[in-house]
C-alpha cells in the first residue's frame, strides 16, 4: 500500500513542481524576454536594431501616380472644373542609402544622423518611362502669383510669363516634373531666383536632417524618439503644440506596443507630427503584427476636431477653418502654395474636390498604415500615401490666370511609399524573436498544464486509494 501511495504522492509532487515551475517561468520568462529585447532594441553598435536602423534591409519603393490634366484650355478660358486622369505607377527605389554622420552622444543618450535621399527608377515596376509626358499645372506660374500678390510685381511677372510663352498648364516629362527642370519664365526674372523647379527638387544628393534621436540606453521607452530635428525641438511652421516634433520617424517605436496606444511620429514630407491608432491584428509572413492607421480625425477641421486648430493657418482657402483633409504647408516650402492631402482627397471636405473631376478616393488604396511588431516596436510593413497639390488663384494681373473665377487646389501627383520585411528577414525574425517567444510560451503552458493535470490526477488517485484502504 505504501509503495502505491508513495508513488501517487511523488507524482502529485512532481506535478506540483512542474506547475509551479511553469507558473514561475511566466514572469521570469517575460523578464528574460524584456531584458533581451531591451538590450537588442537600443540604438548602439552591436545590436540587431542598430544594424537595421543604419541601413534598412527592407527594399522601399515609392510609386507615383501623376494627375494628367485633360482640359487645360477649358480651365484657363472658362474656369471649368479640372478633369484629371491618373497615370501610374511610376516606381522608384528609395531610402537605400545608409544613414550618414552617425554620432552617439553619451551625455544625453542620443544619436544624431542624416538620412540621405536617393531615387532609382524601376522600369519593370512602372507603366512607362521617365520620358513620359504629362499635362500639369505650371508650377512656377502658380507659385509666383501666390508668393508675390503685389500688383506691381504681378504686372512685371505677367510680362515675363507672356515673353516666355508660359501658360497656366505645361507639358513636362516625369523626370522633369519630379526631379526638376529649368523654367523658361523664371529664367527671365531679372533678379537672383532659383530657375529650377520640380516637385521634389532638389532630391538626389541631398539629405534629410540632422535628426537627433534617443538611443534608449537610459530608458528603453524613449528609444528612437526624436529629440531634435535640424537642431530644434520645434518646426517654426505652426502655432502652439502643432509645432512640436513628436514621437519617432515611424521606422520603429519603443518596444512593447499596446493596442490602446496612440503612436506619434514626425514626417518631414508633411512638415508636421501626426499619429496612428490601432486598427486590427495582422499576420505578416507568420509574424503577428498590429496594424496602426492614420485616422480621419487627424485630417479633420478644427470644427470637427478642436485639436487641429493650430494646423489652420489661413482663413480664406480653408473657408474660415471649416474645410478639412488638406494641409497648407506653404510655410515649410518657402511660401510656395503647397497643400498636402491623402490621395484623391480621401477624408477631405467636398468643397476641396468640387473643382476637380476624375477622382475616386477609397480607403483601401489611399490610406496610410503601419504594421508594427508589438514586442520590438519595429515597423515591419508600411504604406505611406500622400498627395501633393498646388493652389492656384485668379489674378487680374497675370493674363493666363485672369479668367479664373475661383481658387483651385490642383492635385499634381500622389505617391505610395511601401516597405515590407523580406522573406529571409521574416524567417530570421520568426526564429530569433517570435519563435523564441512562442516556444517559451509553449513550454510555460506545457509545464503548467502537464503539472496541474499530473497533480490533480495523482491527488485524486491518492485520495481514492486512501479511502479504499480506510474502508
Amino acid at each position: 500500500g505504501c509503495d502505491r501511495n508513495c508513488g501517487l504522492i511523488t507524482g502529485a509532487v512532481i506535478g506540483a513542481v512542474l506547475a509551479v515551475f511553469g507558473g514561475i517561468l511566466m514572469p521570469v520568462g517575460d523578464m528574460l524576454i524584456q531584458k533581451t529585447i531591451k538590450k537588442e532594441v537600443v540604438l548602439e553598435e552591436g545590436t540587431i536594431a542598430f544594424k537595421n536602423w543604419v541601413k534598412t534591409g527592407t527594399e522601399i519603393y515609392r510609386q507615383f501616380w501623376i494627375f494628367d490634366v485633360q482640359n487645360p484650355q477649358e480651365v484657363m478660358m472658362n474656369s471649368s472644373n479640372i478633369q484629371v486622369k491618373q497615370r501610374g505607377p511610376y516606381t522608384y527605389r528609395v531610402r537605400f542609402l545608409a544613414k550618414e554622420n552617425i554620432t552617439q552622444d553619451p551625455k544625453d543618450n542620443t544619436v544624431s544622423f542624416l538620412q540621405p535621399n536617393g531615387a532609382i527608377f524601376e522600369p519593370s515596376l512602372s507603366v512607362g518611362t521617365e520620358a513620359d509626358n504629362f499635362t500639369v499645372l505650371n508650377l512656377a506660374v502658380a507659385a509666383a502669383s501666390h508668393i508675390y500678390p503685389n500688383p506691381f510685381v504681378q504686372v512685371v511677372l505677367n510680362s515675363l510669363i507672356n515673353k516666355s510663352k508660359s501658360s497656366m498648364f505645361q507639358v513636362r516629362t516625369l523626370r522633369e516634373l519630379l526631379w526638376g527642370y529649368t523654367d523658361p519664365f523664371l529664367s527671365l526674372v531679372p533678379y537672383p531666383v532659383s530657375t529650377r523647379v520640380g516637385m521634389f527638387y532638389p532630391y538626389n544628393n541631398t539629405a534629410d536632417g540632422v535628426y537627433k534621436v534617443f538611443n534608449g540606453k537610459d530608458s528603453i521607452s524613449k528609444v528612437a524618439i526624436i529629440d531634435t530635428y535640424k537642431g530644434k525641438r520645434n518646426l517654426s511652421y505652426w502655432e502652439s503644440y502643432c509645432d512640436m516634433i513628436n514621437g519617432t520617424d515611424a521606422a520603429s517605436f519603443p518596444p512593447f506596443v499596446e493596442k490602446s496606444q496612440v503612436l506619434q511620429f514626425f514626417s518631414s514630407d508633411i512638415c508636421r507630427s501626426i499619429y496612428a491608432v490601432f486598427e486590427s491584428d495582422v499576420n505578416l509572413k507568420g509574424i503577428p503584427v498590429y496594424r496602426f492607421v492614420l485616422p480621419s480625425k487627424a485630417f479633420a477641421s478644427p470644427v470637427q476636431n478642436p485639436d487641429n486648430h493650430c494646423f489652420c493657418t489661413e482663413k480664406i482657402i480653408s473657408k474660415n477653418c471649416t474645410s478639412y483633409g488638406v494641409l497648407d504647408i506653404s510655410k515649410c516650402k518657402e511660401g510656395k502654395p503647397v497643400y498636402i492631402s491623402l490621395p484623391h482627397f480621401l477624408y477631405a471636405s467636398p468643397d476641396v474636390s468640387e473643382t476637380i473631376d476624375g477622382l475616386n478616393p477609397n480607403e483601401e488604396e489611399h490610406r496610410t498604415y503601419l504594421d508594427i511588431e508589438p514586442i520590438t516596436g519595429f515597423t515591419l510593413q508600411f504604406a505611406k500615401r500622400l498627395q501633393v497639390n498646388l493652389l492656384v488663384k485668379p489674378s487680374n494681373k497675370i493674363q493666363v490666370l485672369k479668367r479664373l473665377k475661383r481658387n483651385y487646389i490642383v492635385p499634381i501627383l500622389w505617391l505610395n511609399e511601401t516597405g515590407t520585411i523580406g522573406d529571409e528577414k521574416a524567417k530570421m525574425f520568426r526564429s530569433q524573436v517570435t519563435g523564441k517567444i512562442n516556444l517559451l510560451g509553449l513550454i510555460e503552458m506545457i509545464l503548467l498544464s502537464v503539472g496541474v493535470v499530473m497533480f490533480v490526477a495523482f491527488m485524486i488517485s491518492y485520495c481514492a486509494c486512501r479511502s479504499k484502504t480506510i474502508k
Epitope: Y148, P149, N150, P151, F152, V153, V155, V156, N158, S159, P190, Y191, P192, V193, N396, K397, K402
Partner: antibody
Framework: EVQLQQSGPELVKPGASVKISCETS????????MHWVKQSHGKSLEWIGG????????KYNQKFKGKATLTVDKSSSTAYMELRSLTSEDSAVYYC???????????WGQGTLVTVSA | ETTVTQSPASLSMAIGEKVTIRCITS??????MNWYQQKPGEPPKLLIS???TLRPGVPSRFSSSGYGTDFVFTIENLLSEDVADYYC?????????FGGGTKLEIK
C-alpha cells in the same frame, strides 16, 4: 497708420544730380512696392518707376531710364530716387507712392519740389 | 505703351449737379482703371481702384464704370469740397499711364 515722409525741396544747378528720400513707417516696408511719380507745374502725373524692396526688383518707365535710379535701404525703411544730368525739364514735384496689397498708389508722400535753375 | 485720353480737360458745374469724366485707353485693359482726386497743394488721393471698387471712406456719390477701353467716372450731387483735379490711371500694364487730368470747378 502708414506714413510716407519725403525730404525737403531742392534747388539744383543744371547738369547736377539730386537724391530725394522717402521714409516710411507704419507698415512692413519690404512687402509693398514704392513708386515715384513726377508732376510738372500745372501738368498731369507721370509714372517714373517702381521698386519692390523685398528683392530690389525695379521697373522703369522707358522715358526715365538713365535719368532716375531707384534704391531702398531696408534697415531704415527708406526709398531713394536719384535724378542725374538735370535740366529745366526736370523741375517738378516728385512724389513717392506706396501700393497696398491689391491697390496702386494707396498712400502718397507729401511731395518734394525740385527746381533746376542756373 | 497704353495711352490714356481723358476728357474734358476742365469743367465748371453747379453744386448738386452730376459730373461725368471719361477716359479712353489705346489698348484693352479689362477693368484695370483707377481714379484719383488731387486738391491744390496736396498729393493725389485714391478714390476708386481696379474693378470699379470704391475705396473705404470715400463717399458713395463717387462711382465709376467701364471695361475694356472706355471708362466713366461720375460724381452724383456735386459738393463744393469736390473742387479738385481728377486723374485716371491704367494699371493693366507697364509703364503705368495717367490721363491728362480734369480740372473741376464750381460755377
Amino acid at each position: 497708420e502708414v506714413q510716407l515722409q519725403q525730404s525737403g525741396p531742392e534747388l539744383v544747378k543744371p547738369g547736377a544730380s539730386v537724391k530725394i528720400s522717402c521714409e516710411t513707417s507704419g507698415h512692413t516696408f519690404t512687402e509693398y512696392t514704392m513708386h515715384w511719380v513726377k508732376q510738372s507745374h500745372g501738368k498731369s502725373l507721370e509714372w517714373i518707376g517702381g521698386i519692390y524692396p523685398n528683392n530690389g526688383a525695379t521697373k522703369y518707365n522707358q522715358k526715365f531710364k538713365g535719368k532716375a535710379t531707384l534704391t531702398v535701404d531696408k534697415s531704415s525703411s527708406t526709398a531713394y530716387m536719384e535724378l542725374r544730368s538735370l535740366t529745366s525739364e526736370d523741375s517738378a514735384v516728385y512724389y513717392c507712392a506706396r501700393d497696398r496689397y491689391d491697390v496702386w498708389f494707396a498712400y502718397w508722400g507729401q511731395g518734394t519740389l525740385v527746381t533746376v535753375s542756373a | 505703351e497704353t495711352t490714356v485720353t481723358q476728357s474734358p480737360a476742365s469743367l465748371s458745374m453747379a453744386i448738386g449737379e452730376k459730373v461725368t469724366i471719361r477716359c479712353i485707353t489705346s489698348t484693352d485693359i479689362d477693368d484695370d482703371m483707377n481714379w484719383y482726386q488731387q486738391k491744390p497743394g496736396e498729393p493725389p488721393k485714391l478714390l476708386i481702384s481696379e474693378g470699379n471698387t470704391l475705396r473705404p471712406g470715400v463717399p458713395s456719390r463717387f462711382s465709376s464704370s467701364g471695361y475694356g477701353t472706355d471708362f466713366v467716372f461720375t460724381i452724383e450731387n456735386l459738393l463744393s469740397e469736390d473742387v479738385a483735379d481728377y486723374y485716371c490711371l491704367q494699371s493693366d500694364n507697364l509703364p503705368l499711364t495717367f490721363g491728362g487730368g480734369t480740372k473741376l470747378e464750381i460755377k
